[in-house]
């Protein structure tokens, strides 16, 4: 018995085609992905395979404007329109609270949305009882395929599912919903989750009775064969796992942003054993076009996009400096706005002992591509936070040795004075650089503020320490030089829509004037 | 091989009454939520009520509460729909379905997702 399994992952938001690097679309006959063609490929695919399963791997939330005007209702809308048979929940689902999961997606969704290590308590239990599932059994053709989810346990930490959600160890929740798919004589069963790859190829290595392993959170991108476009695999699709009791488990992840339709065609036999798997991520390019009906309908639904992207956020009362005259050479006050929009945007009490788990933020001066004026009565929109962040990136996580950090400083203004966007802004960090040493050895003073205090105060940073900070996904990736950050990440997860960070920051205070206040001092 | 088969349709008055009953072989209907649903001709199947394994929970839809009632016996491994007081707009082929999954009775009937197990049907016909 053949099975097919289409599947996404972190689509974040992309419901339009995209440019190739999954920003705004520019050039539309060079634009890719976008659920109006992801339609045409899947229905194409459901219209020649008897036996085909849709499944989204999670973090459809959050990552464009389309998310911060409808706030889960178009994940809903689309993906019903689509006819995905299940989805995991993941971190991000939960960026607008757990109310921001149950109202648009949950009590919307037509197809289930799984998490077997989510445990709901207190009087959160018997609201969201039902709404989200820790397996389900779907029909498939004459056969009958369990689907069990998980997600992220870092999730209190990457966004705010509350305190009323409990996330388990992954394996040690999937183990028991797996064990009681095989009692029901539920023979082929998927895992569909959301914790990264390392994670996915544990569950295929640990949990008894997993078939295939489907996953997201990490962006893998996994391809046999010569790859299509930019991205580079991080191994064979599928990933084979050799399990503790000695079978092979398929294991796929397709990247992000709804660029490709992950394809994987599994043979069982009839006991429900994976004979085979083959299969490889399909770029959806512009060779495939857009489905007419759903195109319309994202038409009808962009409407009020437009409208919010002039309307005004809150005002201030200073000029926002976002020029290279500064940010490049200087502390200015919109790194100083931004950086502090980041690290609000992470507040997170999750131990008492701790008045946050992060404190510190750092952003390539590069990155800051425009002023706002406050002369236009104060306004701020959406539109003019476009101008400032116009690369549709995103503000992540990592975690970083001490030494790690001080290098990142060093390449800051190693090569000082010549306009280059390296030179770092700063939240929760005290520098000082003297510029008449030699690159390598300019920064004289690094103090960072504690996150394990009562009262925040600037310590001395400590090489060996590991410290988590906030920062824009292009500086994780090792962009601008900043070799020294991809290479050397301990820990990296994917955050918010860099604007829709600032926007959500400025909507809060609704009157900002940001200062110049010696977070950079050159001695 | 698993199989759910229902039994006790056929012809009635209307107000009169019918017992409708689907047993199950190849598998334990205690872990399955169960729902009776039907099918009337030129219209679309919908659910009529349903119980989980559990705690035994049930729900009806609107058209038939009161008049009907849903029961099982885990012992016989089977599920029963109680219908009295019918009606002619309750001519429909009445089909019993199964789910292991832990949806609720709720979701379980609208049929909010798909359902893996399905009888093959009986004919409940109200006619004088």
């Known amino acids: 018995w053949e099975l097919t399994i289409l599947h996404t992952n972190d689509v974040h938001s992309r419901l339009e085609q995209t440019s190739e690097d999954s920003s705004k679309c520019v050039n539309a006959s060079r634009c890719m992905g976008g659920v109006a063609r992801l339609f045409t490929k899947v229905q194409q695919i459901r219209r020649a395979e008897p036996n085909v399963l849709l499944l989204d791997a999670g973090d459809q939330y959050q990552g464009t404007i389309w998310f911060t005007v409808y706030k889960g209702a178009e994940v809903a809308h689309f993906m019903n329109a689509l006819r995905y048979d299940a989805m995991a929940l993941g971190n991000h689902e939960f960026d607008n609270g757990v109310e921001g999961l149950i109202e648009p997606l949950l009590k919307e969704a037509k197809f289930p949305i799984l998490s077997a290590n989510i445990k709901a308590k207190g009087p959160l239990a018997s609201q969201i009882s039902g709404l989200y599932l820790p397996y389900k059994v779907l029909p498939v053709g004459d056969e009958v395929v369990g689907i069990v989810g998980y997600t992220s346990k870092e999730t209190p930490f990457l966004s705010n599912p509350g305190t009323n959600l409990v996330f388990e160890d992954e394996i040690t929740a999937l183990q028991p919903e797996v064990d009681k798919l095989k009692t029901l004589n539920v023979n082929k069963i998927i895992a569909l989750g959301h914790s990264g790859f390392e994670m996915d190829k544990l569950i295929a290595q640990k949990v008894r009775g997993v078939d295939v392993v489907v996953g997201g959170h990490s962006n893998t991108f996994l391809y046999t064969g010569n790859p299509p476009s930019k991205e580079v695999p991080a191994g064979k699709y599928p990933f084979i796992v050799t399990s503790d009791d000695g079978r092979k488990v398929p294991v796929v992840q397709a990247y992000a942003f709804g660029k490709y339709l992950g394809y994987l065609k599994i043979e069982f036999d009839e006991r429900g054993n994976v004979i085979s798997s083959h299969g490889n991520p399909i770029l959806l390019n512009s060779s495939i076009p857009e489905d007419p009906s759903i195109k319309a309908d994202i038409n009808k639904w962009r409407i009020k996009l437009d409208n919010y992207s002039t309307q005004e956020l809150g005002k201030t009362i200073v000029y926002l400096d976002g020029s290279s005259q500064s940010c490049r050479f200087r502390e200015c006050n919109m790194g100083n706005l931004i950086c502090d929009a980041m690290i609000n945007n992470n507040l997170r009490h999750t131990d008492e002992m701790f008045w946050n788990h992060v404190s510190m933020c750092i952003l390539n001066g590069g990155g800051i591509r425009s002023p706002i004026d406050e002369r236009n009565n104060g306004t701020i929109t959406w539109e003019n936070l476009a101008a400032v962040l116009p690369f549709g990136g995103t503000f992540d996580l990592v975690q970083l040795k001490g030494s790690t950090l001080k290098k990142a400083f060093e390449h800051s203004v190693h090569r000082y004075g010549q306009s280059t966007g390296e030179f770092l802004q700063v939240g929760g960090i005290h520098v000082v650089y003297d510029l008449s040493r030699k690159p390598g050895d300019r920064v004289v003073k690094l103090d960072v503020l504690c996150t394990k205090c009562r009262v925040p105060s600037y310590d001395p940073l400590k090489m060996d320490e590991v410290y988590k900070v906030i920062l824009p996904n292009f500086l994780a990736n090792g962009g601008d030089g900043f070799q020294m950050i991809k290479d050397e990440l301990l820990r990296h997860d994917s955050g918010d829509q860099d604007i829709n960070v600032v926007s959500t920051y400025i909507s809060k205070m609704k009157v900002i004037y940001p200062a110049v206040e010696g977070r950079i001092k050159f001695s | 091989q698993r199989q759910l088969v229902e039994s006790g349709g056929g012809l009635v008055q209307p107000g009169g009454s019918l017992r409708l009953s689907c047993a199950a072989s190849g598998f334990l209907l205690d872990y399955y939520v169960i729902g009776w649903f039907r099918q009337a001709p030129g219209k679309e199947r919908e659910g009529v009520s349903c119980?989980?394994?559990?705690?035994?929970?049930?729900y009806y839809a609107d058209s038939v509460k009161g008049r009907f009632t849903i029961s099982r016996d885990n012992s016989k491994n089977t599920v029963y729909l109680q219908m009295s007081s019918l009606r002619a707009e309750d001519t429909a082929v009445y089909y019993c379905a199964a789910d292991p999954s832990p949806v609720t009775v709720q979701a379980m009937c609208l049929p909010r997702f798909p359902v893996p197990y399905w009888g093959q049907g009986t004919l409940v016909t109200v006619s004088s």
């Open positions: 119980i989980s394994g559990s705690d035994r929970s049930t």
